[in-house]
């Protein structure tokens, strides 16, 4: 079942999932000037059987200006730089993920995707928080939130994290180095 609301917002922190439970949906959002192709699915869905989970459907964006074409527009230098960073981040995320049964890994980027990813999480999902660049973590407990449910009532637990002052960002589970991204990682992790 889907979680009714978003994971909690922590000031000066971002969250990400190390892996996504089956049933999770990721909106196929495109950056400004692009739109989802007409025949394209509105979302990707994490599905699987007992041995393997993967994302169903692929997101595809096309130029809003171009009519009835799926031809991709070559990114401008600034866009290429931004895409490289996102690709690098995704590769790093993939590298530090262990295959969990019943879970999908972070989907790779698609061309001209929006900067912000919008996930629809399911009950039982855990997300992990880290402070953005320039803030350090004060932990009172785990910097994570779990979507739990009792008979239709869903709620995210409150992560025990405060981000304060100046220093390197804290790390997500499985990451050895703090991320180089100026906004911390992921730059865009949100849910519906």
């Amino acid at each position: 079942e889907l979680c009714d609301d978003d994971p909690p917002k922590i000031t000066h922190a971002t969250f990400k999932a190390v892996a996504y439970k089956e049933g999770t949906m990721l909106n196929c959002e495109c950056k400004r000037g692009f739109r989802r192709i007409k025949s394209g699915s509105p979302y990707m869905l994490c599905t699987g059987n007992s041995s393997h989970s993967s994302w169903d459907n692929q997101c595809q964006c096309t130029s809003s200006a171009a009519r009835n074409t799926t031809k991709q527009v070559t990114p401008q230098p600034e866009e290429q730089k931004e895409r490289k960073t996102t690709e690098m981040q995704s590769q790093m995320q993939l590298a530090d993920q262990v295959s969990l049964p019943g879970h999908c890994r972070e989907p790779p980027p698609w061309e001209n995707e929006a900067t912000e990813r919008i996930y629809h999480f399911v009950v039982g999902q855990t997300v992990y928080y880290q402070c953005v660049q320039g803030y350090r973590a004060l932990h009172r407990g785990p910097a994570e939130s779990v979507c739990k449910m009792t008979h239709g009532k869903t709620r995210w637990t409150q992560p025990q994290l405060i981000c304060t002052g100046e220093t390197e960002p804290s790390q997500f589970p499985g990451e050895e180095e703090p991320q180089a991204s100026p906004d911390g990682l992921p730059e865009s992790e949100t849910s519906r």
Partner: antibody
Framework: EVQLQQSGAELVRPGASVKLSCTAS????????VHWVKQRPEQGLEWIGY????????EYASKFLGKATITADTSSNTAYLQLSSLTSEGTAVYYC????????????WGLGTLVTVSA | DVLMTQTPLSLPVSLGDQASISCRSS???????????LEWYLQKPGQSPKLLIY???NRFSGVPDRFSGSGSGTDFTLKISRVEAEDLGVYYC?????????FGGGTKLEIK
Amino acid sequence: EVQLQQSGAELVRPGASVKLSCTASGFNIKNDYVHWVKQRPEQGLEWIGYIDPDNGDTEYASKFLGKATITADTSSNTAYLQLSSLTSEGTAVYYCTTDDTSYGMFACWGLGTLVTVSA
Amino acid sequence: DVLMTQTPLSLPVSLGDQASISCRSSQSIVHSNGNTYLEWYLQKPGQSPKLLIYKVSNRFSGVPDRFSGSGSGTDFTLKISRVEAEDLGVYYCFQGSHVPWTFGGGTKLEIK
């Protein structure tokens, strides 16, 4: 292994109070809801209420309002049921149970605590 | 409160027979989110209850496929295709759609 360990049997006088405990092992109660269920001798099951240990929110069946109080201590991974002003109607086995994280149903049960109210 | 009525109160069966238990709610138990939180629990003598079926027809992990649940709205049924000795005990239906959540009175499955 996921388990709920409940406190031992209690013999209490009419009008007195008793506090039962339910300690979880193998999981963090903060990430769950803990419920209490009553079963009188040779009778059926009655849902008393639940607590969200993460924030202390509780919900009770109306017949147990003012009679039962559910609390939790996340540091010891324990939930409690306090029963007050007990009468012979309070003689029962009290079970704690938690939801399966993914399904939200009563998947894990303690073995129960027998409370006997007698003069 | 939603009243859950189970029939029969007692169900004598022979091992290998099919058993069917009915549960009727006093009002629709469709939750506001569209799901129906109707569950079946088995309590064996001297033990805690155990979850068998959730959301009307979904078997909980480890529950044998001889158990099946069906129904909608206010009428629900638990079927055991071939009764085994380990299935004996008291079966309870439960609704978790409307607070206060309520159990049925129980059906005792026993050897004929």
